[in-house]
């Protein structure tokens, strides 16, 4: 089994992923592992001299770049929040900051922008990864209300006045809560009709 | 031959201070990040607190945060752990251990022999 | 912090038999861009540190035996020793690297049946 620096007549190597094609010595050489970079080139009798990234620098991938990449931090100008640090072997890990979502995107989010209100009787459509959209507002199911303009507000169950030990006042809607009162108390005048009927 | 060897621990009363040295040898000491971690008897690993190669950057379990305090010496290749206002469930073996990265937040390829730390009346 | 949850907690193993622990992760420790797992695991024999064995959740380090593997992504992991020889009885720990803190799982005691 071949060890890098090793001939290769078909411009190939072996492992794709750890070794590369130098071709001014038509030479298989490694690569360097992630957190590291090449400090001497490989030759016919030597391979990839590998050096640690310094700090606030990264490469994530068996490279063979003779530089790490720098440090970026998350930008909350733009919106970002530090999910998780740089280290030699990732660059830091960002997301839109809560009530935000991702705008702009290139590889990565590079910019993030408030999430819309949904209105009285509608809430935000779950997503299964947050941030990665605007709001999608959707009304509330039946037996359920919400009554503010907000981009994160649930739609809540309606409360049931019996569980209280009280009566149904007035029934719940999709932008209110159902109104209960004391079962001894009289009826308000505009809804007595109603009793009496 | 990479080594790193802990000293400084031993018996302290609640409330007491100790102070850990782990002297390194055969690395590039200050291109590397490194840690401690410690192992109550017979309970799991838990990482206490990380210093970056260059010693801008630290971090603490929430265990210890505000009485521990993390640092390094580059030039004698040297790290230590503060401890103060030291209880009885901080009583454990004292690890230092490197990461292969200048932070912390790593694998850990060498780790010392450890450092008992017991803290009782 | 992310918990790390070691199955099971003991294990007795025949000599030259099949040893499988697993390691799960209470959030995805994969990384997208390189699609890495920031995962370890290391054998602490009595009265030794830790020592490491595998990273990258697959990768063994130098001077390791091959039958140390390990597999797995995302949140569940496990770790292999094919044929259990004497001198790997001890407890194997799995720790995440994801994220600060970093955080290692209780540990499995390795025996041999």
């Known amino acids: 089994q071949a060890v890098p620096p090793y001939a290769s007549e078909n411009q190939t190597c072996r492992d794709q992923e750890k070794e590369y094609y130098e071709p001014q010595h038509r030479i298989c050489c490694s690569r360097c592992p992630p957190g590291t970079y090449v400090s001497a080139k490989c030759s016919r009798i030597r391979d990839t001299v590998c050096a640690t990234c310094a700090e606030n620098s990264y490469n994530e991938h068996w490279n063979y770049l003779t530089i790490c990449q720098l440090c970026r931090p998350c930008d909350p100008v733009m919106g970002l929040e530090e999910i998780a640090p740089c280290t030699s072997k990732r660059k830091t890990q960002c997301r839109c900051q809560p009530g935000m979502f991702c705008a702009a995107w290139a590889l990565e989010c590079t910019h993030c922008e408030l999430l819309s209100d949904c209105p009285p009787g509608t809430e935000a459509e779950l997503k299964d990864e947050v941030g990665k959209g605007n709001n999608h507002c959707v009304p509330c199911k039946a037996g359920h209300f919400q009554n503010t303009s907000s981009p994160s507000a649930r739609c809540q169950p309606h409360t049931r006045c019996e569980n209280q030990g009280l009566v149904e006042a007035a029934p719940g809607t999709a932008q209110s809560d159902t109104t209960c009162k004391n079962p001894l108390e009289p009826l308000p005048p505009e809804m007595s009709g109603t009793m009496l009927m | 031959e990479v080594q790193l060897v802990e000293s400084g621990g031993g018996l302290v009363q609640p409330g007491g201070s100790l102070r850990l040295s782990c002297a390194a040898s055969g690395f590039t000491f200050s291109s590397y990040a490194m840690s401690w971690v410690r192992q109550a008897p017979g309970k799991c690993l838990e990482w206490v607190s990380g210093?970056?190669?260059?010693?801008?950057?630290?971090n603490y379990a929430d265990s210890v945060k505000g009485r521990f305090t993390i640092s390094r010496d580059n030039s004698k290749n040297t790290l230590y752990l503060q401890m103060n206002s030291l209880r009885a469930e901080d009583t454990a073996v004292y690890y230092c251990?490197?990461?292969?990265?200048?932070?912390?937040?790593?694998?850990?390829?060498?780790w010392g022999q450890g450092t008992m730390v017991t803290v009782s009346s | 912090d992310i918990v790390m949850t070691q199955s099971p907690d003991s294990l007795a193993v025949s000599l030259g038999e099949r040893a499988t622990i697993n390691c799960k992760s209470s959030?995805?420790?994969?990384?997208?861009?390189?699609?890495?797992?920031?995962l370890t695991w290391y054998q602490q024999k009595p009265g030794q540190p830790p020592k490491l064995i595998i990273y990258w959740a697959s990768t063994r380090e130098s001077g390791v035996p091959d039958r140390f593997s390990g597999s797995g992504s995302g949140t569940d992991f496990t770790l292999t020793i094919s044929s259990l020889q004497a001198e790997d009885v001890a407890v194997y720990y799995c720790q995440q690297y994801f994220n600060t803190p970093p955080t290692f799982g209780c540990g499995t005691k390795v025996e041999i049946k």
């Open positions: 959030q995805n420790v994969l990384y997208s861009s390189n699609n890495k797992n920031y």
């Open positions: 210093i970056s190669g260059s010693g801008g950057r630290t």
């Open positions: 251990a490197k990461s292969d990265n200048w932070h912390y937040l790593d694998a850990f390829d060498i």
